[in-house]
């Protein structure tokens, strides 16, 4: 969490941002909140990006003002106009690109004063893994697949029964470049699995960590997966 205060002028207002990560090809949110004002027409929101000459987005006098918007953001940004009055200056970003990564500044002016806060935005690709029993294999084998990751992640297998065991000798992981030539499909195969055990396939890069679990018994197979973004710090 980054909290910024205005330093110029007589008054300062608190502006709060949260570091976040964007999944390339999907929409992202750059979070920013501020002390609200009673009049929408008195609020100015400016989003800036370090190293970019034009503005990312500007909202003032109750409407978007995009005449100074940088070319890389045209048609790709929007504030939640109906929520500005309650102090939400968050920015929606369409079709996140790798090049959107960087340091952003949320700069606010209201009748109470000015304030700003920076936000670190990481971009990459992350997706939920799915673990299945590979019935085509000669021995009992598990196959963990996740369709989109970038940068290249690490894959680690773990088991509930053999806690702390190293499965690197009995697993094989491959990375296949997807058609857009950036993200990769992750496939990891675990051999010689035993029934009545829960196995976890953990995929991690510097942006996200995802886990796919599978519990194999004689009577049923249970699956579960979850994904967690790393380094979500508020400012």
């Amino acid at each position: 969490l980054i909290i910024g205060f205005g330093i110029s002028g007589r008054h300062s207002i608190t502006v709060t941002t949260v570091a976040s990560a964007g999944n390339i090809g999907e929409d992202g949110i750059l979070s920013c909140t501020f002390e609200p004002d009673i009049k929408l027409s008195d609020i100015v929101i400016q989003w800036l990006k370090e190293g970019v000459i034009g503005l990312v987005h500007e909202f003032k006098e109750g409407k978007d003002e995009l005449s100074e918007q940088d070319e890389m953001f045209r048609g790709r940004t929007a504030v939640f106009a109906d929520q500005v009055i309650v102090g939400n200056a968050s920015l929606r970003l369409k079709n996140v690109q790798l090049t959107d990564a960087g340091t952003y500044k949320c700069y606010i002016i209201t009748s109470k004063g000015k304030g700003n806060a920076n936000l670190e935005y990481k971009t990459g690709a992350f997706s939920m893994p799915e673990v299945n029993v590979d019935y085509n294999a000669s021995s009992e084998t598990l196959r963990c697949e996740a369709p989109r990751w970038f940068p290249q992640p690490t894959v680690v297998w773990a088991s509930q029964v053999d806690q702390g065991a190293n499965f690197s000798e009995v697993s094989n992981t491959s990375f296949e470049l997807n058609s857009e030539n950036v993200t990769m499909k992750v496939v990891s195969v675990l051999y010689n699995v035993t029934i009545n055990n829960t196995y976890s396939c953990m995929i991690e890069n510097d942006i996200a960590k995802a886990t796919g679990d599978i519990k194999v018994t004689e009577s049923e197979i249970k699956r579960r997966s979850h994904l967690q973004l790393l380094n979500s710090k508020a400012s």
Partner: antibody
Framework: QIQLQQSGPGLVQPSQSLSITCTVS????????VQWIRQSPGKGLEWLGV???????DYNAAFLSRLSFSKDNSKSQVFFQMNSLQADDSAIYYC?????????????WGQGTLVTVSA | NIVMTQSPKSMSMSVGERVTLSCKAS??????VSWYQQKPEQSPKLLIY???NRYTGVPDRFTGSGSATDFTLTISSVQVEDLADYHC?????????FGSGTKLEIK
């Protein structure tokens, strides 16, 4: 009330240029981009390009060498020009405004300019 | 270019019936699909944007759904005034593209 009013010729000679003016009201050209779309019986709706609030443009690559957009923010006017028209450019040409600045759909359309390319 | 394929090409329905129109994208377009109604000699009118958001003033019998590649426009109880062509379009990536349309006729 948001409106887009188009003006331009109906008949264009082959190999000549087409110019259309789209005059907008109810919103500012510094807040929203203006899209250009055409519709012909053979090809349906076809996106031609957009002029953004900043004045920068994006064109459909299929028409890149023939298209040019400009605008006058103070007069709330957007100008469309297409060169070297041929018979298959006969269509209804529309200007339109996005529903949001993030371009999720075209909420407001001009009345259209019916263009016939014929000698 | 992303190809938007609409089906059926045309359909004839009775008043009060439920109508389902389909639009499929050749690549993932997130939720950047919009639906338009066009009556003869008129400009297209926006019905749905962002795949599922009903535009201001559009009757609630019109519903949009879907994401990624498969999208649907549903008219829960078709009315005589719904006689029109319906177009879907994607605004996810350049060039923006449209489907070839579905003509809805009323029996």
């Amino acid at each position: 009330q948001i409106q887009l009013q188009q003006s331009g010729p109906g008949l264009v000679q082959p190999s000549q240029s087409l110019s259309i003016t789209c005059t907008v009201s109810g919103f500012s050209l510094t807040s929203y981009g203006v899209q250009w779309i055409r519709q012909s019986p053979g090809k349906g709706l076809e996106w031609l390009g957009v002029i953004w609030s900043s004045g920068s443009t994006d064109y459909n690559a299929a028409f890149l060498s023939r298209l040019s957009f400009s605008k006058d923010n103070s007069k709330s006017q957007v100008f469309f020009q297409m060169n070297s028209l041929q018979a298959d450019d006969s269509a209804i040409y529309y200007c339109a405004r996005d529903v949001t600045t993030i371009v999720e759909g075209f909420a407001h359309w001009g009345q259209g300019t019916l263009v016939t390319v014929s000698a | 270019n992303i190809v938007m394929t609409q089906s059926p090409k045309s359909m004839s329905m009775s008043v009060g019936e439920r109508v389902t129109l389909s639009c499929k994208a050749s690549e993932k377009v997130g939720t950047y699909v919009s639906w338009y109604q066009q009556k003869p000699e008129q400009s297209p009118k926006l019905l749905i944007y962002g795949a599922s958001n009903r535009y201001t003033g559009v009757p609630d019998r019109f519903t949009g759904s879907g994401s990624a590649t498969d999208f649907t426009l549903t008219i829960s109880s078709v009315q005589v005034e719904d006689l029109a062509d319906y177009h879907c379009g994607q605004t996810y990536s350049y060039p923006f593209t449209f489907g070839s349309g579905t003509k809805l006729e009323i029996k």
